[in-house]
Interface confidence: low
């Protein structure tokens, strides 16, 4: 009996972690990335009249709980950390398009949801509207990749998320990304990489 776990692309980047979703004994989604969330929140000024907007920097820390589900055309990664004070959900969809050369399938990141608790004291100091908030992406189409390939991008990418905390926008910063939410052929092994344009340019410059 053999259970081969061949995690590719490992590095010593202290911010990065690997997230794996398994179904029916095999890997169906793999994601390796570092993520940070810039979260604005209001605090009372010392006069208790004015509101001041502070900023919490929340890193996705190692040791997070990983869940998810896989499907033919939709896959989801869920990551929970700091005793579930924070939760990240990433929804991936696979679509077929009619091109001049014929049908062409791609997958993309179609939705991001970040749930945070501004009553969590290590990141938020006396937030006025302390409690659970949800920040969602709007009409997202990111990390677009040909079907059967993994997406790789070392460069930083930002995604804006509209928060349920009124008039607040959360910024998600992704870096050192390597993701494959569909069509994993071999257990724990990424397929051929589709590199982001920034990384492609850097390779040409080298």
């Amino acid at each position: 009996e053999q259970e081969v776990e061949n995690l590719s692309g490992l590095s010593t980047n202290p911010e990065k972690d690997i997230f794996v979703v398994r179904e029916n004994g095999t890997t169906c989604l793999m994601a390796e990335f570092a993520a940070k969330f810039i979260v604005p929140y209001d605090v009372w000024a010392s006069n208790y009249v004015d509101l001041i907007t502070e900023q919490a920097d929340i890193a996705l820390t190692r040791g997070a709980e990983v869940k998810g589900r896989c499907g033919h055309s939709q896959s989801e990664l869920q990551v929970f950390w700091v005793d579930r004070a924070y939760a990240l959900k990433m929804l991936f969809v696979k679509e077929s398009h009619n091109m001049s050369k014929g049908p062409e399938a791609t997958w993309r990141l179609s939705k991001v949801q970040f749930v945070y608790d501004s009553s969590e004291k290590t990141h938020f100091k006396d937030a006025v509207s302390a409690g659970k908030h949800t920040a969602n992406s709007h009409h997202l189409s990111a990390l677009v990749t040909p079907a059967g390939k993994s997406y790789e991008c070392q460069a930083q990418q930002t995604i804006s998320l509209a928060s349920s905390d009124p008039q607040k926008t959360v910024t998600m910063i992704l870096s050192a990304v390597h993701i494959q939410p569909f069509d994993i052929i071999s257990d724990f092994v990424f397929s051929e990489e589709h590199k982001c344009p920034v990384d492609e340019r850097e390779q040409l410059e080298e």
Epitope: E1, Q2, E3, V4, E5, N6, L7, L10, S11, T12, I18, V20, R22, E23, N24, G25, G63, E65, V66, K67, F188
Partner: antibody, heavy 119, light 106 residues
Framework: EVKLEESGGGLVQPGGSMKLSCTAS????????MDWVRQSPEKGLEWVAE??????????YYAESVKGRFTISRDDSKSSVYLQMNSLRTEDTAIYYC??????????WGQGTSVTVSS | QIVLTQSPAIMSASPGEKVTITCTAS?????MHWFQQKPGTSPKLWIY???YLASGVPTRFSGSGSGTSYSLTISRMEAEDAATYYC?????????FGGGTNLEIK
Amino acid sequence: EVKLEESGGGLVQPGGSMKLSCTASGFTFSDAWMDWVRQSPEKGLEWVAEIRGKADNHATYYAESVKGRFTISRDDSKSSVYLQMNSLRTEDTAIYYCIPYYRYAMDYWGQGTSVTVSS
Amino acid sequence: QIVLTQSPAIMSASPGEKVTITCTASSSVSYMHWFQQKPGTSPKLWIYATSYLASGVPTRFSGSGSGTSYSLTISRMEAEDAATYYCQQKSNYPWTFGGGTNLEIK
């Protein structure tokens, strides 16, 4: 916070039986693969058995040295994993640890329970 | 089964010294985990998936390797690093551990 509590160890005669229990908390137990690992001065750290999560139909795996003698089982409703040990031998003497393998490695270890097989 | 051979079995290092512990597998493995154990305590996951530091592990530790050859390195030895370190593979059943390296402080 992840907590693991092993129990059921003690002194048993060669050929005897013993059942170890482990109660876990602080993570989604039904998703976790659970391992038993033992440690003795003679053999060092030795993996004993593994039972996978619900998604993997609770598949079980054993070390050759315990196959046919030990049985691993779990009760997800009680967040517990068990190791039924039969036909015990003196070389089974060790500290037994139950460990969740719910990410990529043996992330958390309890204090272990001591098993002594001696006449 | 895959046999993991650690070397050296016992070593001592002075504070500030660079330390490297190696783990050689009898056949190729996908990646290696490392555990730290101090007397009278349970082992602790120290490095997982070859190069990832477990939570709370000082950044002076690093892990590297591939195939049959893996290593754990401490860039500058400190007194609190004195412990026994074990490598472990979870690529092929049965999961196996190395015999351990007992690292002492001079």
